[in-house]
Amino acid sequence: TPEVWVQVRMEATELSSFTIRCGFLGSGSISLVTVSWGGPNGAGGTTLAVLHPERGIRQWAPARQARWETQSSISLILEGSGASSPCANTTFCCKFASFPEGSWEACGSLPPSSDPGLSA
C-alpha cells in the first residue's frame, strides 16, 4: 500500500523558518502534490503550495520556496516573519495524487525536541 511521509524541521539560523519535506512511497507516477498547513486541505487547512510535474509550481505566502527533490518527494521552505508565520505546533499536510490510483496524504508537525523554547 502506498504511503506518504512528512518531515518538519525548524531552521537553526532562523527560528521561525521551517522546512517541510514530503515523500510518496508507492509505484504510481505523481500528478500533483498539495501542501497545506493547519490541517488537510478542505478540512480547515490552508494551501501553501501546489506542485505539478509538468505545469510547474504555485505557492502562497508564507511559502518561500517549493521544489521537487525527486519524482516522488518535495520540499518547501516557509518564511519566518509576519503575522502569517507558523508556530512550533503547526500541523503541515501533504497530499500526493497519482492517476489512476488515487490520493494519499499525511500530516506532521515539528517534533517536541526541536522546539527552541524547550532547549536548555
Epitope: 505545469r55 489512476p100 488515487g102
Partner: antibody
Framework: DVQLVESGGGLVKLGGSLKLSCVAS????????MSWIRQTPEKRLELVAA????????YYLDTVKGRFTISRDIAKNTLHLQMSSLKSEDTALYYC?????????????WGQGTSVTVSS | SIVMTQTPKFLLVSAGDRVTITCKAS??????VAWYQQKPGQSPKLLMY???NRFTGVPDRFTGSGYGTDFTFTINTVQAEDLAVYFC?????????FGGGTKLEIK
C-alpha cells in the same frame, strides 16, 4: 474550445467486438489523463477504463478486465477503447472524458457519447 | 471499492426553492468529490470540484460542502433550467465511483 467527439458505437452480437474512438481538440491531448465512462440503461455511471498522460498507467473496471483495452494515438489526438467478448451488460452509452489534475481528477470535459447495444 | 450513497433519488420542487442533495462515502474520500449535472439528452457537465469549487461558468447558486465521508450539494433559488439529474463522484481512490444520481424535477 475543448471538444471530445466519440464514434464507433453500434449494434453488436453477443461475444462480438467493437472499437470506440474519441477525437480530442482544443487542448494538448498528451498532457491529460483520459477515460471512458459508460451510462447504463438504468442511468448509472461507471468508469470503465482510464489512461494516464504517460500512456503507461491504466485502470479497468473489474468486469471488463481482459476484454477491453484503452489506448491513445497522440499523433491523431484520438483515444480508443477496443472492446471484445461483449456481454449484454456492456450495453450502455459510452462517453470519453478528460481529467484535470488541478481539479482533483474531476472530469472537466465530456464527449456527447456513443451508444453500444449488445444483442443476442 | 468506495460506495457513494446519494439521497434522495427524486426531488420535485418549485422554482425559487432551495434544494439539498447529500452524498455519503463508505470510507473517507478527503475533499476529492465532484458534482455533475446531466440535463435531458445531454452528457454530464462538471459543476463542482474539490467539494466546493465551482467550475468555470457555473452560477453561484450552486454550492458544495463536506469533508471525509459526508457531502452536501445545494442549489439556492432553483430555476427552471436546473431540471436535470445530479451525480456526486469520488476521485480519492481508484476506482472512481459515482453516486446513483438525483433527478430534479420542477413543478
Amino acid at each position: 474550445d475543448v471538444q471530445l467527439v466519440e464514434s464507433g458505437g453500434g449494434l453488436v452480437k453477443l461475444g462480438g467486438s467493437l472499437k470506440l474512438s474519441c477525437v480530442a481538440s482544443g487542448f494538448t491531448f498528451s498532457s491529460y489523463h483520459m477515460s471512458w465512462i459508460r451510462q447504463t440503461p438504468e442511468k448509472r455511471l461507471e468508469l470503465v477504463a482510464a489512461i494516464n498522460s504517460n500512456d503507461i498507467n491504466t485502470y479497468y473496471l473489474d468486469t471488463v478486465k481482459g476484454r477491453f483495452t484503452i489506448s491513445r494515438d497522440i499523433a491523431k489526438n484520438t483515444l480508443h477503447l477496443q472492446m471484445s467478448s461483449l456481454k449484454s451488460e456492456d450495453t450502455a452509452l459510452y462517453y470519453c472524458a478528460r481529467h484535470e489534475d488541478y481539479y482533483g481528477f474531476a472530469m472537466d470535459y465530456w464527449g456527447q457519447g456513443t451508444s453500444v447495444t449488445v444483442s443476442s | 471499492s468506495i460506495v457513494m450513497t446519494q439521497t434522495p433519488k427524486f426531488l420535485l420542487v418549485s422554482a425559487g426553492d432551495r434544494v439539498t442533495i447529500t452524498c455519503k462515502a463508505s470510507q473517507s474520500v478527503s475533499n476529492d468529490v465532484a458534482w455533475y449535472q446531466q440535463k435531458p439528452g445531454q452528457s454530464p457537465k462538471l459543476l463542482m470540484y474539490y467539494v466546493s469549487n465551482r467550475f468555470t461558468g457555473v452560477p453561484d447558486r450552486f454550492t458544495g460542502s463536506g469533508y471525509g465521508t459526508d457531502f452536501t450539494f445545494t442549489i439556492n433559488t432553483v430555476q427552471a433550467e436546473d431540471l436535470a439529474v445530479y451525480f456526486c463522484q469520488q476521485a480519492y481512490r481508484s476506482p472512481w465511483t459515482f453516486g446513483g444520481g438525483t433527478k430534479l424535477e420542477i413543478k
